[in-house]
């Protein structure tokens, strides 16, 4: 049995330009201790979309549902979507360390942007 699952329930989300996109992610446990980060794309060129403790992400807001009992919610909302935001977004769990170590990624959610 897996000790930690990172779940991105939607494979794809389609949003009209100018609207907001909600990207859902839950983790089954806080253990191992460490942060959740959001990225667009994979590999060394991936773009950091949101980190709770570091950086400035003016268009990104955490929208977790803290009432969830059986898992932890790490969902985000990206406002004022433009075609440049299209891509696949990954919710990634890290194990705390120096530096933090990537542990497990969600399956990804593809964001497509429709014309207004």
């Amino acid at each position: 049995e897996e000790e930690l699952q990172v779940i991105q329930p939607e494979k794809s989300v389609s949003v009209a330009a100018g609207e907001s996109a909600t990207l859902n992610c839950t983790a089954t446990s806080l253990i191992p201790v460490g942060p959740i980060q959001w990225f667009r794309g994979v590999g060394p060129g991936r773009e950091l979309i949101y980190h709770q403790k570091e950086g400035h992400f003016p268009r990104v807001t955490p929208v977790s549902d803290p009432t969830k009992r059986n898992n932890m919610d790490f969902s985000i909302r990206i406002s004022n979507i433009t075609p440049a935001d299209a891509g696949t977004y990954y919710c990634v769990k890290f194990r705390k360390g120096s530096p933090d170590v990537e542990l497990k990624s969600g399956a990804g959610t593809e964001l497509s942007v429709r014309a207004k």
């Epitope: 049995e1 000790e3 201790v33 942060p35 709770q52 919610d73």
Partner: antibody, heavy 118, light 112 residues
Framework: EVQLVESGGGLVKPGGSLRLSCAAS????????MSWVRQTPGKGLEWVAT????????YYPNSVKGRFTLSRDNAKNSLYLQMNSLRAEDTAVYYC???????????WGQGTTVTVSS | DIVITQSPASLAVSLGERATISCRAS??????????MHWYQQKPGQPPKLLIY???NLESGVPDRFSGSGSRTDFTLTINPLQAEDVATYYC??????????FGGGTKVEIK
């Protein structure tokens, strides 16, 4: 009904060792994060150790790190705390605690008393 | 370490009145909109019992006269109206990403 039953407490001399056990029933033990929390009249509640559901990850505060070792046997629904190099300040009631997400301490056993004294 | 200052240490409230307990963390215990502060009740001779998880969520089976509020560093447990069976010691506990996890010193609630 969730049940956590601790055993193994007792009187031990400073520098000695004890092994606490916790027998779990009434829930899917292998899916839960497990911890020990201790309570003393002077210091109140103090987190002692936590282990992930599969046993891969363990965490301790500095006060017990290197002296206490937490392990689990999911086949036996059991949790163990090996306590070495015991000190007078380790005297406390030790509670076995389960946690669904590793966030809050959801269910507590009745506790077992450890007394470290010469 | 995140230090939790819980106040008051003891509280005497009349039956049917409101009891309010506060916990202040030395730094934020929030992440992704979750506040990792929890509240427990302990009656004499018994282990602690979870009342409120993640600042404001009532644990199953806990009466709704108990409520929790707050975020970041400041949190409150409210019992309204206080009943005789609520006489106990109440503890807050933070389980943020920063170890070690810590508890408040406790608040003993009595009937005035």
């Amino acid at each position: 009904e969730v049940q956590l039953v601790e055993s193994g407490g007792g009187l031990v001399k400073p520098g000695g060792s004890l092994r606490l056990s916790c027998a779990a029933s009434g829930f899917t033990f292998s899916s839960y994060v497990m911890s020990w929390v201790r309570q003393t009249p002077g210091k109140g509640l103090e987190w002692v150790a936590t282990i992930s559901s599969g046993g891969t990850y363990t965490y301790y505060p500095n006060s017990v790190k290197g002296r206490f070792t937490l392990s689990r046997d999911n086949a036996k629904n059991s949790l163990y705390l090996q306590m070495n190099s015991l000190r007078a300040e380790d005297t406390a009631v030790y509670y076995c605690v389960s946690s669904m997400t590793g966030s809050s301490f959801d269910y507590w056993g009745q506790g077992t008393t450890v007394t470290v004294s010469s | 370490d995140i230090v939790i200052t819980q106040s008051p240490a003891s509280l005497a409230v009349s039956l049917g009145e409101r009891a309010t307990i506060s916990c202040r963390a030395s730094e934020s215990v929030d992440s992704y909109g979750n506040s990792f502060m929890h509240w427990y009740q302990q009656k004499p001779g018994q282990p602690p019992k979870l009342l409120i998880y993640r600042a404001s969520n009532l644990e199953s089976g806990v009466p709704d006269r108990f409520s929790g509020s707050g975020s970041r560093t400041d949190f409150t447990l409210t019992i309204n109206p206080l009943q005789a069976e609520d006489v106990a010691t109440y503890y807050c506990h933070q389980s943020s990403e920063q170890l070690p996890w810590t508890f408040g010193g406790g608040t003993k609630v009595e009937i005035k």
